[in-house]
C-alpha cells in the first residue's frame, strides 16, 4: 500500500514535469534506493545538478535567457570537481559562456544565481580577466588546460546551462 501510494505520487509528479520536459532520465538514490533523481533527456548529471551544453552561438544575455526558458541558468561552477566533470563533454576548440559577468566593468564579478563570487574558487587562465570591456566569462581550453577568460558579452558563443536535479 505504501509502495503503491509512492508510485502514484511519482506518476503525478512525472506528469507535472512532462509539460516542461518531454523526457526525463532518472536514477534511484537514497539509502533505501527509494528516491529518484532526474534530469531532462539529454542533459547530463553530476551530484545534485543537471547540465546542458548548447551549441547554438548566442550573446551572453541571449544564452542566459535560453537557459532560463528551460528552467535553468548559465552554469555556476562551485568546485574544481564540478568543472572537471563539465569539461569532459566540451570541445577543446570551442568556448562556452558561464553564468559569470561583470556588467559595469568594475571587476565586480557576479554569478547569475546570486551565489557569492569567491576569488579563492576561480579558474581563470593566467593573466585573466584582463579587460574592463570584457564583461562576461567563458570557459575554454588554453595552454593544455581548461580555464576561464573574460570576453565581450555581445559576441556569440556556445554555452552551458545548469539546473537542480528533479526529485520524484
Amino acid at each position: 500500500n505504501f509502495m503503491y501510494s509512492k508510485t502514484v505520487k511519482r506518476l503525478s509528479k512525472l506528469q507535472e514535469y512532462q509539460q516542461y520536459y518531454p523526457s526525463l532520465t532518472c536514477v534511484m538514490e537514497g539509502k533505501d534506493m527509494e528516491d529518484w533523481s532526474c534530469c531532462p533527456t539529454p542533459w547530463t548529471s553530476f551530484q545534485s545538478s543537471c547540465y546542458f551544453i548548447s551549441t547554438v552561438m548566442q550573446s551572453w544575455t541571449k544564452s542566459q535567457n535560453n537557459c532560463s526558458v528551460m528552467g535553468a541558468d548559465l552554469v555556476v561552477i562551485n568546485t574544481k570537481e564540478e568543472q572537471d566533470f563539465i569539461t569532459q563533454n566540451l570541445k577543446i576548440n570551442s568556448a562556452y559562456f558561464l553564468g559569470l559577468s561583470d556588467p559595469k566593468g568594475w571587476r565586480h564579478w557576479q554569478w547569475v544565481d546570486q551565489t557569492p563570487y569567491n576569488k579563492n574558487v576561480t579558474f581563470w587562465h593566467s593573466g585573466e580577466p584582463n579587460s574592463p570591456d570584457e564583461r562576461c566569462a567563458i570557459i575554454n581550453f588554453r595552454s593544455e588546460e581548461w580555464g576561464w577568460n573574460d570576453v565581450h558579452c555581445h559576441v556569440p558563443q556556445k554555452s552551458i546551462c545548469k539546473m537542480k536535479k528533479i526529485y520524484i
Epitope: S59, T61, N65, S101, P103, G105, D133, R135, V151
Partner: antibody, heavy 121, light 111 residues
Framework: EVQLVESGGGLVKPGGSLRLSCAAS????????MSWVRQAPGKRLEWVST????????YYPDSVKGRFTISRDNAKNSLYLQMNSLRAEDTAVYYC??????????????WGQGTTVTVSS | DIVMTQSPDSLAVSLGERATINCRAS??????????MHWYQQKPGQPPKLLIY???NLESGVPDRFSGSGSGTDFTLTISSLQAEDVAVYYC?????????FGGGTKVEIK
C-alpha cells in the same frame, strides 16, 4: 577634444580595392574598441566592422565578411579598413566611431565626419 | 539579426511642441535592468551624434529637452519642446548582440 578624421575614400570600379584610414586624437586610443559604420545614400546606418581595444577580437556582418579587414595601429593612433572585391552596394559614406561599453554591450559616442566610397564602372 | 523599426518615418511639429519617436525591436533588447537601446541625431551633411544611451541616460552636453524611455522591445525618444536646431533625422540602435543594428530613421521637421 576627441577627434576622428577619416580618409582614403574615392571612386573605384567593381572588384577593386580601397584602404580607409581613421586618425584619432584627444583620447587614449589604445583603450577603446573602434568600429566602422556606413550609410548608403538615403539609407539607414549599417555597422561594418569592430575591433577591440587590445586588437584581440574583430567582427564583421555577413555582407562584408571575407572581403573587408579591420585593423589598428595603437602606436599611430590609427584605425584602418581594407576593402577588397568591392561591389556597387558598398557605395556609402564610411564613418569611424569610438565605442563605449555600457553593461553587456556598447554604443558609439564619437563619430568622424566620414569618407565617401563610390563603387561604379 | 535584430530588426529595428522606427515610427513615424517623418514628423512635423510646431516650435515649442512635443515630438515623440518610437522604436520597436524584433526581440527584447533588455536584460534584467539593462536596456541596450541608444538614440542618435543626424543633421544634414553631418555624422550621427549620440543623444541617449541605455534607453534613458542623457549623453553629456545634450539638452534636457531630450529624454528616452522604454524596455524590452518598445522604446521612445521624446523632445519635450522642439527647437529649430532639432531638425534632423533620429536613429535608434540596439547593441544587445552582434551585429548592432539601427532603425530606419525618423525625420523631424518644423510645422
Amino acid at each position: 577634444e576627441v577627434q576622428l578624421v577619416e580618409s582614403g575614400g574615392g571612386l573605384v570600379k567593381p572588384g577593386g580595392s580601397l584602404r580607409l584610414s581613421c586618425a584619432a586624437s584627444g583620447f587614449t586610443f589604445r583603450s577603446y574598441g573602434m568600429s566602422w559604420v556606413r550609410q548608403a545614400p538615403g539609407k539607414r546606418l549599417e555597422w561594418v566592422s569592430t575591433i577591440s581595444s587590445g586588437d584581440s577580437y574583430t567582427y564583421y556582418p555577413d555582407s562584408v565578411k571575407g572581403r573587408f579587414t579591420i585593423s589598428r595601429d595603437n602606436a599611430k593612433n590609427s584605425l584602418y579598413l581594407q576593402m577588397n572585391s568591392l561591389r556597387a552596394e558598398d557605395t556609402a559614406v564610411y564613418y569611424c566611431a569610438r565605442q563605449i561599453y555600457y553593461d553587456y554591450a556598447y554604443y558609439f559616442d564619437f563619430w568622424g565626419q566620414g569618407t565617401t566610397v563610390t563603387v561604379s564602372s | 539579426d535584430i530588426v529595428m523599426t522606427q515610427s513615424p518615418d517623418s514628423l512635423a511639429v510646431s516650435l515649442g511642441e512635443r515630438a515623440t519617436i518610437n522604436c520597436r525591436a524584433s526581440e527584447s533588447v533588455s536584460f534584467r535592468t539593462s536596456h541596450l537601446m541608444h538614440w542618435y541625431q543626424q543633421k544634414p551633411g553631418q555624422p550621427p551624434k549620440l543623444l541617449i544611451y541605455g534607453a534613458s541616460n542623457l549623453e553629456s552636453g545634450v539638452p534636457d529637452r531630450f529624454s528616452g524611455s522604454g524596455s524590452g522591445t518598445d522604446f521612445t525618444l521624446t523632445i519635450s519642446s522642439l527647437q529649430a536646431e532639432d531638425v534632423a533625422v533620429y536613429y535608434c540602435q540596439q547593441s544587445i548582440e552582434d551585429p548592432p543594428t539601427f532603425g530606419g530613421g525618423t525625420k523631424v521637421e518644423i510645422k
